[in-house]
Amino acid sequence: DDESSKPCCDQCACTKSNPPQCRCSDMRLNSCHSACKSCICALSYPAQCFCVDITDFCYEPCKPSEDDKEN
């Protein structure tokens, strides 16, 4: 399964406004997650990409949390 296919984010930051403005700062290789509308990639190999979308929510984390690992 391609790393970029699942819309998820480990490093999401939001303003505390209602509604918020959230941005994912995860770096991914070669492409952004599947729900990203504006993806910027560095001219390197492999390309390092990040999504510059501003959303009103955070996607679920990609990595299971420590709590999830225990259960």
């Epitope: 209602n18 959230c22 929510f57 955070c58």
Partner: antibody, heavy 120, light 112 residues
Framework: EVQLQQSGAELVKPGASVKLSCTGS????????IHWLRQRPEQGLEWIGK????????EYGPKLQGKATITSDTSSNTAYLQLNSLTSEDTAVYYC?????????????WGQGTLVTVSA | DVLMSQAPLSLPVSLGDQASISCRSS???????????LEWYLQKPGQSPKLLIY???NRFSGVPDRFSGRGSGTDFTLKISRVEAEDLGVYYC?????????FGGGTKLEIK
């Protein structure tokens, strides 16, 4: 478990002030916003205002601007609502609630409410 | 201010029935970011309100799937597919798209 515990009922005289408290447990109030709302007898719900306890920033609804002051004390995980120059129109149940702004949800968890009665 | 109007004021139902509550806003409640911030709350007798639905159709955690929300623009509906005794109380819609944020006047769901 996220819980908000509010202070007890208040009976106050017209013209007086009152300060209500809302203490969080199971979460850190700095992580979200704390909102205050009220419900007057036989009436609907009304948003009063909110505070970001992480920095003390506040916002108020237009109807209670000047009457309500929201503060917080992060060391005790508590938010406060002070109401000044009370009249019988301010008789209501006052609720605090925490948002989950990153969902985004406005009023995710509510306190049990504090009844404020303004009477001579 | 955006006026939120709910209908009916009172809704008598039999347990197991479907219930439908309408909420209309006096103006379009699409936020400038393109999203619609319409929430539904249930206040049971003697309790504080509890969140059921956010952003028109998203169930909050722990809310049974018999609750569903839909709508757009100015017209919104909360449906309860099979009413249970624990669903009785007053339902409020709320809009967070335009300041000041406002609630509907409530719909009381009661036993027929």
């Amino acid at each position: 478990e996220v819980q908000l515990q509010q202070s007890g009922a208040e009976l106050v005289k017209p013209g007086a002030s009152v300060k209500l408290s809302c203490t969080g447990s199971g979460f850190n109030i700095k992580d979200n916003n704390i909102h205050w709302l009220r419900q007057r007898p036989e009436q609907g719900l009304e948003w009063i205002g909110k505070i970001d306890p992480a920095n003390g920033d506040t916002e108020y609804g237009p109807k209670l601007q000047g009457k309500a002051t929201i503060t917080s004390d992060t060391s005790s995980n508590t938010a406060y609502l002070q109401l000044n120059s009370l009249t019988s129109e301010d008789t209501a149940v006052y609720y605090c609630a925490t948002d989950l702004y990153s969902k985004p949800v406005w009023f995710a968890y509510w306190g049990q409410g504090t009844l404020v009665t303004v009477s001579a | 201010d955006v006026l939120m109007s709910q209908a009916p004021l009172s809704l008598p139902v039999s347990l197991g029935d479907q219930a439908s509550i309408s909420c209309r806003s006096s103006q379009n409640i699409v936020h400038s970011n393109g999203n619609t911030y319409l929430e539904w709350y249930l206040q049971k007798p003697g309790q504080s309100p509890k969140l059921l639905i956010y952003k028109v159709s998203n169930r909050f955690s722990g809310v049974p799937d018999r609750f569903s929300g839909r709508g757009s623009g100015t017209d919104f509906t909360l449906k309860i597919s099979r009413v249970e005794a624990e669903d009785l109380g007053v339902y409020y819609c709320f809009q967070g798209s335009h300041v000041p944020w406002t609630f509907g006047g409530g719909t009381k769901l009661e036993i027929k």
